[in-house]
Interface confidence: medium
């Protein structure tokens, strides 16, 4: 079941999925001056069996001018693309991404792809939020949103995240340095993420499921 809406927008924050559930679609979008090849698929689809998931189809872009020139998929690691509505500031670094059953990893870039990626998420998808550069969270640890099915409708849960401006006085001024975490867990710069259905202030949690590690930078 596809999620009806995009994940919630959080002021001065961006989101990222670290793994995509089977059924997720990624539009094959090309940058200006390029178009999808005529025989090319309009989207990539995360599909799989019990042991392995991968993206079906390949996105290919060709120059709008040169009608018969096909540009093959050439991964360019320096071109890390992000989902529509996000402007990731390279603050989210996947440090040890282990394959999650029933999930696909971020697809590699294709040549001349658009600067924004448009995903169509499915129920059960989790995305993680972080404040953009120049802003920081009033808490440490990840904030997440999950697409849930409730009363026959899909809804994204609300990440309890507030990003405060470090230089702009109008953006929640007067923030103090965070005190020690009340539960005594260390507030390291690496947060282990637990995929739960509890989406409130996410404090540092010792994860039993070491699926992936999310490295975040706090000023």
């Amino acid at each position: 079941e596809l999620c009806d809406d995009d994940p919630p927008k959080i002021t001065h924050a961006t989101f990222k999925a670290v793994a995509y559930k089977e059924g997720t679609m990624l539009n094959c979008e090309c940058k200006r001056g390029f178009r999808r090849i005529k025989s090319g698929s309009p989207y990539m689809l995360c599909t799989g069996n019990s042991s392995h998931s991968s993206w079906d189809n390949q996105c290919q872009c060709t120059s709008s001018a040169a009608r018969n020139t096909t540009k093959q998929v050439t991964p360019q690691p320096e071109e890390q693309k992000e989902r529509k509505t996000t402007e990731m500031q390279s603050q989210m670094q996947l440090a040890d991404q282990v394959s999650l059953p029933g999930h696909c990893r971020e697809p590699p870039p294709w040549e001349n792809e658009a600067t924004e990626r448009i995903y169509h998420f499915v129920v059960g998808q989790t995305v993680y939020y972080q404040c953009v550069q120049g802003y920081r969270a009033l808490h440490r640890g990840p904030a997440e949103s999950v697409c849930k099915m409730t009363h026959g409708k899909t809804r994204w849960t609300q990440p309890q995240l507030i990003c405060t401006g470090e230089t702009e006085p109008s953006q929640f001024p007067g923030e103090e340095e965070p005190q020690a975490s009340p539960d005594g867990l260390p507030e390291s710069e690496t947060s282990r993420l637990v995929t739960t259905t509890d989406f409130r202030i996410q404090t540092e949690v010792a994860a039993t499921m070491e699926t992936f590690i999310f490295t975040t930078e706090y000023q």
Partner: antibody, heavy 122, light 106 residues
Framework: QVQLVQSGAEVKKPGASVKVSCKAS????????MHWVRQAPGQGLEWMGI????????SYAQKFQGRVTMTRDTSTSTVYMELSSLRSEDTAVYYC???????????????WGQGTLVTVSS | EIVMTQSPATLSLSPGERATLSCRAS??????LAWYQQKPGQAPRLLIY???NRATGIPARFSGSGSGTDFTLTISSLEPEDFAVYYC????????FGGGTKVEIK
Amino acid sequence: QVQLVQSGAEVKKPGASVKVSCKASGYTFTSYYMHWVRQAPGQGLEWMGIINPSGGSTSYAQKFQGRVTMTRDTSTSTVYMELSSLRSEDTAVYYCARGGAEYIPAEYFQHWGQGTLVTVSS
Amino acid sequence: EIVMTQSPATLSLSPGERATLSCRASQSVSSYLAWYQQKPGQAPRLLIYDASNRATGIPARFSGSGSGTDFTLTISSLEPEDFAVYYCQQRPFLPTFGGGTKVEIK
């Protein structure tokens, strides 16, 4: 169910300080931000600041900078708002309000305390 | 600081009538706006969040609309318990409230 119970009314002299408490129950205290909002008699609502009960970090409205201090005690699930250098215009009802819910953003106030009237008079 | 301006200051209506309350922001707040109801001697109650989403337990007669700088709270048919003061509040920046609109019985 979620409950926010505030301390009783206070009468203070100008220049003094007041500390209002707000005890939370019915949910995991460290899981949601807590805001403070005040309302002068017959007037509108004014946001004062916010505290993260988990880490204790705070953010205050410019107007109250230097005069307000928000703290929390996780052992009793209580947040405190202390306002110093009181003046007559600080006479107001002070509310604690929990930010957010599963589908509601953290900057909206879903649950409120009953309010604490602070009167500043010489 | 974003200034929120509500109009009218007072709305005199009879039960069963439709109430339309307006809230204007001094700059765009996208759809990040909430509406609260406050009765005398009580704390405010969240009605609408993010411009058009009803909070839990809020009757369907309350609806919100608008985006950018102009927002509207509509009460389709006023019930006796709806006579109160209504406030709007924006959230993209330091939270600020409007001055309120009092809905009174005509």
